[in-house]
Amino acid sequence: QAAKEVLLLDSKAQQTELEWISSPPSGWEEISGLDENYTPIRTYQVCQVMEPNQNNWLRTNWISKGNAQRIFVELKFTLRDCNSLPGVLGTCKETFNLYYYETDYDTGRNIRENLYVKIDTIAADESFTQGDLGERKMKLNTEVREIGPLSKKGFYLAFQDVGACIALVSVKVYYKKCWSIVENLAVFPDTVTGSEFSSLVEVRGTCVSSAEEEAENSPRMHCSAEGEWLVPIGKCICKAGYQQKGDTCEPCGRRFYKSSSQDLQCSRCPTHSFSDREGSSRCECEDGYYRAPSDPPYVACTRPPSAPQNLIFNINQTTVSLEWSPPADNGGRNDVTYRILCKRCSWEQGECVPCGSNIGYMPQQTGLEDNYVTVMDLLAHANYTFEVEAVNGVSDLSRSQRLFAAVSITTGQAAPSQVSGVMKERVLQRSVQLSWQEPEHPNGVITEYEIKYYEKDQRERTYSTLKTKSTSASINNLKPGTVYVFQIRAVTAAGYGNYSPRLDVATLEEASGKMFEATAVSSEQNPV
């Protein structure tokens, strides 16, 4: 039996009597015979060659067709040459007829010949003579006929003898199906062939265990009328953690992984990573090593860098310049940046607190790509510790102790801080009297204050200055009816402080002696 055939009847496979219906009973006879290999089998023989007009029918038992539509009938038979039978030339024939009758159930033992549909007249390609009998040359003829499409649940086959000397050695009834196969990691189930010789049945495959359909490429095959699968379309691919082995998806072994179904094969775990179970889609990082969220699974696990090297500093009053060399170990990454941590420390116990937000960093405090920074606006005569930490993409994932280079310094004299609380005390046509408060941080002895003023319309293109040692002053020789801008800064031995915010004051008009309040307008600080 070829793999693509599903047997509905095989007379050779039956050890007991077939007990088919013979009509008349003196016609076809069931006897034990031999097949082509001289194996005993049940055969039906008829050799009614003496009388003319033979009409001997042999009918099989009812054959359920299952879900078949096209049925094949294979007959193996031997036919004796009429010339080997003396004296019967007028009555002996060398053909027989094959019929079928469709029905939904077993109709009993009566053969109603008129209901049967003729399939074909069967003739032998080879008949054998008396001489062949002696040599045991039982010449076996094989004929295959097709019936269908069938519409009922089953059918009978019938053989009509019209006067031949014949032995039915084998009757095989089958239909063809495409047997379940695995192709492109898809299982295609047993599929019965179509009802027509040229028909193709499209079948959708189901992915094998641990496989999935390739995107927008569902696996399909066509089952041909001959029971053969035709060229596959689409495919399944092994899921993450699995790779193809023959017709199956096998899990990646330990120390291997496959992160995507698109990858063909499992890969060895990248450096500093491992998988201690089968079927891994990614490898876990070793202790102390990490994978950044943006790192693809195929890159090595990395660790935070070591501390920057050769940290040096330069102090200029309340400004510190820091410079360093890259870390000896970048942790296996090339995204190293630096961040600066500033701590202000007390003189006594050496306790330190973060510097706060009023400190300036140039170019920036974190995310430094270059290996230098300038820290500004420090307090004068204060102790500071600066920690320079090298950072990479996995530093924030690490729970281990930070690695940094540190330096402790003491700042020198600093310029005073900004003057505050500038007020106009009196405004006249040609003079304005101002007062202010001492800076919050004088950073030494204030030697004088410098007042800068200019007509607002001039936008500082030309300005005048006036110096005073006190915290008030009268500015004279102004134009009546004009808006002036005033800014004040403190001066110490260490230098100039920053100017106070701008204060706009309008002098009185000449015609009127009336005083009025000018509105103070503060603006951004002007640099020295």
Partner: antibody
Framework: QVQLLQSGAEVKKPGASVKVPCKAS????????MSWVRQAPGQGLEWMGW????????TYAQGSTGRFVFSLDTSVSTAYLQISSLKAEDTAVYYC??????????????WGQGTLVTVSS | EIVLTQSPATLSVSPGERATLSCRAS??????PAWYQQKPGQAPRLLIY???TRATGIPDRFSASGSGTDFTLTISRVEPEDFAVYYC????????FGQGTKVEIK
């Protein structure tokens, strides 16, 4: 039940004739050929020939003389063996036997009980 | 004319034993012989025809084989009712019998 019924023993003088009947029953007489076999006392079997019961066409064994004639009466399903000019050496049991043709070979599957013909002066 | 020679003429066996009867043709025959059994006072009985087909009602201890000129009838285990004379017969254009083998009780 298929049967071949033959007549009882016959005693004949040399030169006489005898006609041995063989009546068939239990099957269609004309569907099978009929063969004749004789067995001399204490001897083996000797095939004499056969007749096509449908056409009446006889086939005689090689070396057979014209003294043996096979005939039929299909109306009574009977075959006959007639021996003329009997000789002492014709003394034997005469059997009719139905011929069985098959695809794979032939044989005589049903035998009459035999008719003993004795030729004696 | 083809002559069939059977041997031995007499075969003595005990019940239950195997009996092997030979039939040799004077020339290669065109068919395998049929085999017959004949008991005293009875008509012959067809045992085997068509090379190896047992006739209706014949037990399967009887089997036949051979080709060309040498043929054999085997009784695998002789039963008491098997003691008889056995004839081979070839069927061609002219049918002939062997002279017979007598199987007797040892």
């Amino acid at each position: 039940q298929v049967q071949l019924l033959q007549s009882g023993a016959e005693v004949k003088k040399p030169g006489a004739s005898v006609k041995v009947p063989c009546k068939a029953s239990g099957y269609t007489f004309t569907s099978r050929a009929m063969s004749w076999v004789r067995q001399a006392p204490g001897q083996g079997l000797e095939w004499m020939g056969w007749i096509n019961t449908n056409t009446g066409n006889p086939t005689y064994a090689q070396g057979s003389t014209g003294r043996f004639v096979f005939s039929l009466d299909t109306s009574v399903s009977t075959a006959y063996l007639q021996i003329s000019s009997l000789k002492a050496e014709d003394t034997a049991v005469y059997y009719c036997a139905r011929v069985r043709f098959t695809v794979y070979g032939d044989g005589m599957d049903v035998w009459g009980q035999g008719t003993l013909v004795t030729v004696s002066s | 004319e083809i002559v069939l020679t059977q041997s031995p003429a007499t075969l003595s066996v005990s019940p239950g034993e195997r009996a092997t009867l030979s039939c040799r043709a004077s020339q290669s025959v065109s068919s395998n012989p049929a085999w017959y059994q004949q008991k005293p006072g009875q008509a012959p009985r067809l045992l085997i025809y068509g090379a190896s087909t047992r006739a209706t009602g014949i037990p399967d201890r009887f089997s036949a084989s051979g080709s060309g000129t040498d043929f054999t009838l085997t009784i695998s285990r002789v039963e008491p009712e098997d003691f008889a004379v056995y004839y081979c017969q070839q069927y061609g254009p002219s049918w002939t019998f062997g002279q017979g083998t007598k199987v007797e009780i040892k």
